[in-house]
């Protein structure tokens, strides 16, 4: 008949499993329970996947691995005797008197419950990596953490290569024995120990459970170190950079940590497993019963088969590992789980030209000299699209792309951003807002919804802020409705007249050039260069200023660059920025200074795009370590990452304007990186590519 094979990971667990099997059999519980011996939780997961076992209880990290790598699903969850049900919360605690926030943890002293412990290590480290605050090169998480904090106590890290830093704050017992042991010998071990490390001033932040502070303050603790501690003297660090009272852990935490759960193969009936265990817990979970499901005392161990603190087992409704773990914990695990043995030795970078091949070759050599991992290899392609194809086909791994190409890479080829470029705050030519500028005119004021029949000024055909975004946005919002994919004709019929300078026109609608003026002699009308006086962002604004047009589609800086004395040309010399306004997508008008809230889209920075199965944290980890050495254009280390002047080119591998490579943080998809408005505009345009 039917049987369920439970996987045990040790002799004591096998012993308890045998007793449980016997107890269930005697009670007539069906299906029958058998026990299979595995060597570890990982081994058991492999046995279940191979259909040699059926079930095991796992912690969050193991559920993540089992689900992601082997397709197992959680079907029964543990509930513990506490108010938060099937989970608890991992928090970061600081002294109220300190000024530490989640964004200023670099260099502070840290207290952890123990190496590889959930709230003391896995969640905080995973969260810091996943959020981009902590960069990890070559999967060496221990090195990354030891470099990040200004000394730590991580009980159990004494056997690692980074014990000097990771055990620096540990003190052992009263006689100095057991320093950094993953045991009560180390006074700063476990939840209370990590909190003590903070309370005694050894560390500046403690990574503990939501209940730890309240359990060890306000006279609730017996040991002398905690007697005088007040919970009000401590605060929690929130993910958004703020801080909160220690009672606010539901809103302010690093992650909700899921309870342990029973996992099975995807084809196993979860209801059957719950019915089996539910029968068992009904008979064998209370005091005095012949077998104790939720106790391990009799076997001289803790947490065998189930956690000893389990009060009951409950069925899991949505049987996916993602739903059970929750997005916070899931994200933290993504940041943490990096197997050095599965890390490819090379990162193959896509290059598009001879100068780029040369720069990439030099980068590979420079990185190798500094032992940066993974090593760079250079693979050439004919075009950005060809790069995308080759990345999808696993012939290449990474390429830096512009906004429009990121859209194609994500939408058509399924690629994701692994790192982004960051430009100087004052650099408006590389990442900027697209705005619709109008004259301030109370008598003839119109809104973005009333552009039909108006005269429009554009920097040029195909320019991001002058054409792609505004036209895409108007198509997406349903104002412009191209027939037969003919966007040009549709735009020409939407506006009364326009100036949209163009190079090498073919069949170009005349009304798109009707407002253009050409050069001083009236020649070169509508040409896509500066001979046309209304060409470019400055020219489009001039078209508005000189009353040729009613609206100009430009960058957010264009008005400032050409008013209040910033442009001495006769047409601009007397202009004042307050005489102009912006049209907002919500139908309002706004001051030109309100561009961040009133724009058609933000043109995103370039990003490094990879396959979704590529570990983005190792890509960013490599680039982050590399830029410490090679990021400054004046560095003396023999290679300049963000400068192409040695190669007689520009923007090779990265834009020359890049100041730093940055993590993608939450923007882990092409849509997230590009932003909804920009994507909407591109979708408006791409809907017309027939």
């Amino acid at each position: 008949g039917m049987e369920v094979r439970w996987c045990a990971t040790s002799d004591p667990e096998q012993h308890k499993c045998g007793n449980m099997s016997e107890a269930f059999r005697e009670a007539g519980i069906q299906p029958s329970l058998l026990c299979v011996r595995g060597t570890s939780a990982d081994h058991c997961v492999q046995l279940i996947a191979a259909q040699e076992a059926d079930a095991i209880t796992l912690d969050g990290g193991a559920i993540y691995e089992a689900g992601k790598e082997h397709g197992l699903k959680p079907v029964v969850g543990e509930v513990y005797d506490q108010e938060v049900g099937t989970s608890y919360y991992a928090v970061a605690v600081v002294r109220r008197s300190s000024h530490v926030t989640i964004d200023t943890l670099k260099g502070v002293k840290s207290c952890h419950t123990g190496i590889n412990r959930t709230v003391g290590w896995n969640v905080p480290v995973g969260y810091l990596v996943e959020s981009g605050r902590l960069s990890v090169m070559g999967c060496d998480v221990l090195k990354a953490v030891s470099d990040y904090f200004g000394g730590s106590c991580v009980p159990g890290a004494g056997e690692t290569s980074y014990s000097e830093s990771l055990c620096r704050l540990c003190r052992g017992d009263s006689s100095g024995e057991g320093v950094c042991d993953k045991s009560p010998l180390e006074r700063y071990y476990d939840y209370s120990g990590a909190f003590r490390c903070l309370a005694e001033g050894a560390g500046d932040v403690a990574f503990v459970k939501h209940s730890t502070v309240l359990e060890n303050t306000d006279g609730k603790t017996l040991p002398s170190w905690g007697q005088a501690l007040l919970s009000q003297d401590f605060e929690l660090l929130c993910r958004d950079g703020s801080r909160a009272d220690v009672t606010e852990w539901r809103q302010c935490h690093l992650a909700r940590v899921p309870a342990h759960a029973v996992v099975v193969r995807a084809d196993t009936d979860g209801g059957l497993i719950f019915r089996l265990l539910n029968e068992g817990q009904r008979l064998f979970s209370h005091e005095g019963s012949s077998f104790q499901m939720f106790s391990s005392e009799a076997y001289g161990q803790k947490d065998l088969l189930f956690k000893d603190s389990t009060s009951e087992l409950v069925p899991i409704a949505t049987q996916t590992y993602e739903a059970w773990l929750g997005h916070e914990y899931l994200h933290a695990m993504k940041g943490l789980l990096c197997d050095p043995n599965r890390l490819p030795p090379y990162l193959r970078w896509c290059v598009l030209s001879t100068p780029e091949i040369q720069k990439c070759g030099d980068m590979a050599v420079a990185f190798r000299r500094q032992r940066l991992k993974p090593e760079i290899q250079c693979v050439s392609a004919k075009s950005p699209q060809h790069c995308m194809e080759r990345i999808q086909a696993e012939q290449v791994d990474a390429v830096t792309l512009s906004g429009e190409d990121i859209y194609t890479a994500g939408k058509t080829y399924g690629l994701v951003p692994a790192a982004g470029e960051h430009y100087a705050p004052e650099d408006s030519s590389n990442s900027y807002y697209v705005v619709a500028v109008v004259r301030r005119d109370s008598s003839h004021a119109f809104t973005l919804d009333e552009l039909r029949g108006k005269r429009s000024c554009h920097a040029g055909f195909g320019s991001p802020a002058g054409w792609d975004v505004p036209v895409g946005a108007l198509i997406q919002r349903g104002f412009i409705r191209p027939k037969d994919c003919d966007v040009l004709t549709a735009v020409s019929e939407f506006f009364n007249a326009s100036c949209v300078p163009v190079n090498n026109p073919k069949n170009y609608p005349s009304s798109l050039c009707a407002l253009c003026v050409g050069d001083e002699q009236g020649r070169n009308k509508c040409v896509g260069n500066s001979q046309e006086r209304y060409y470019g962002y400055r020219g489009a604004f001039r078209c508005l200023v000189e009353n040729a047009g009613d609206v100009a589609f430009v960058r957010h800086t264009t008005v400032f660059d050409n008013t209040n004395g910033h442009n001495s040309e006769p047409w601009a010399a007397e202009l004042r920025s307050e005489d102009y306004e912006l049209l907002c997508p919500n139908g309002a008008r706004a001051e030109v200074s309100q561009f961040a809230a009133c724009n058609l889209a933000q043109i995103p920075p370039h990003a490094v795009m990879v396959r979704p199965d590529t570990n983005i944290f190792t890509v960013y980890g490599l680039l982050d370590k590399a830029q410490d050495l090679f990021g400054d254009d004046h560095n003396k280390n023999g290679f300049k990452m963000f400068d192409s002047s040695n190669y007689h080119g520009q923007d090779l591998l990265f834009k020359d304007a890049t100041v730093r490579a940055v993590p993608v943080g939450e923007k882990t998809t092409y849509r997230g990186w590009l932003g909804l408005d920009y994507v909407a505009a591109l979708e408006g345009m791409s809907s017309q590519q027939c």
Epitope: K506, N507, Y508
Partner: antibody, heavy 118, light 107 residues
Framework: EVQLVQSGAEVKKPGESLKISCKGS????????LHWVRQMPGKGLEWMGR????????SYNQIFKDQVTISADKSISTAYLQWSSLKASDTAMYYC???????????WGQGTTVTVSS | DIQMTQSPSSLSASVGDRVTITCKAS??????VAWYQQKPGKAPKLLIY???TRHAGVPSRFSGSGSGTDFTLTISSLQPEDFATYYC?????????FGQGTKVEIK
């Protein structure tokens, strides 16, 4: 050099159908619009409509909308103007003309004379 | 539709004369006006577009001017081969519309 060669003169009776052609050469046929223009005897020029040979999209002058059909076969670089039922008032010279940088007629064919008479 | 009104409908001139033809649009067409030349039994030829831009290969004696609603074609020194009918056309909005033509004849 750009050349537009139109089919020969036609003499038809009212009610008959007709399809005249215009073959483009010396350029990439699908890159430019093709227009049809009517010139009635001793009169001026009237724009009838155009086709984008790349995708077959057409645009008509309303007064000709239900009178004629414009089509193209890009495989043989040829555009067509056709009537399903001719009238005496369709007697005219018909020109095909290729667009240029802008979307109005630049280069013209030699014309096709259509005579409709009972 | 935009109406284009040409004047005169015909004129007589001698070789070497300066000839001016005007065209009026029924509404503002900015500078979107083209001029064509048509000789008897031949197809029209584009001379000028954007009111003043000469098409490739058109002699410099042909010039155009105007914007808004009023436009002019000027032949600075009439040559024997210039005797023909001239049409203006607005290329601002479809349907493209033509003037009724001006016939330039030998005096």
């Amino acid at each position: 050099e750009v050349q537009l060669v139109q089919s020969g003169a036609e003499v038809k009776k009212p009610g008959e159908s007709l399809k005249i052609s215009c073959k483009g050469s010396g350029y990439s046929f699908t890159d430019y619009y093709l227009h049809w223009v009517r010139q009635m005897p001793g009169k001026g020029l009237e724009w009838m409509g155009r086709i984008n040979p790349y995708n077959g999209a057409t645009s008509y002058n309303q007064i000709f909308k239900d009178q004629v059909t414009i089509s193209a076969d890009k495989s043989i670089s040829t555009a067509y103007l056709q009537w399903s039922s001719l009238k005496a008032s369709d007697t005219a010279m018909y020109y095909c003309a290729r667009g240029g940088d802008y979307d109005f007629p630049w280069y013209w064919g030699q014309g096709t004379t259509v005579t409709v008479s009972s | 539709d935009i109406q284009m009104t040409q004047s005169p409908s015909s004129l007589s001139a001698s070789v070497g004369d300066r000839v001016t033809i005007t065209c009026k649009a029924s509404q503002d067409v900015y500078a979107a006006v083209a001029w064509y030349q048509q000789k008897p039994g031949k197809a029209p030829k584009l001379l000028i577009y954007w009111a003043s831009t000469r098409h490739a290969g058109v002699p410099s004696r042909f010039s155009g001017s105007g914007s808004g609603t009023d436009f002019t074609l000027t032949i600075s020194s009439l040559q024997p081969e210039d005797f023909a009918t001239y049409y203006c056309q607005q290329h601002y909005r479809t349907p493209w519309t033509f003037g009724q033509g001006t016939k330039v004849e030998i005096k």
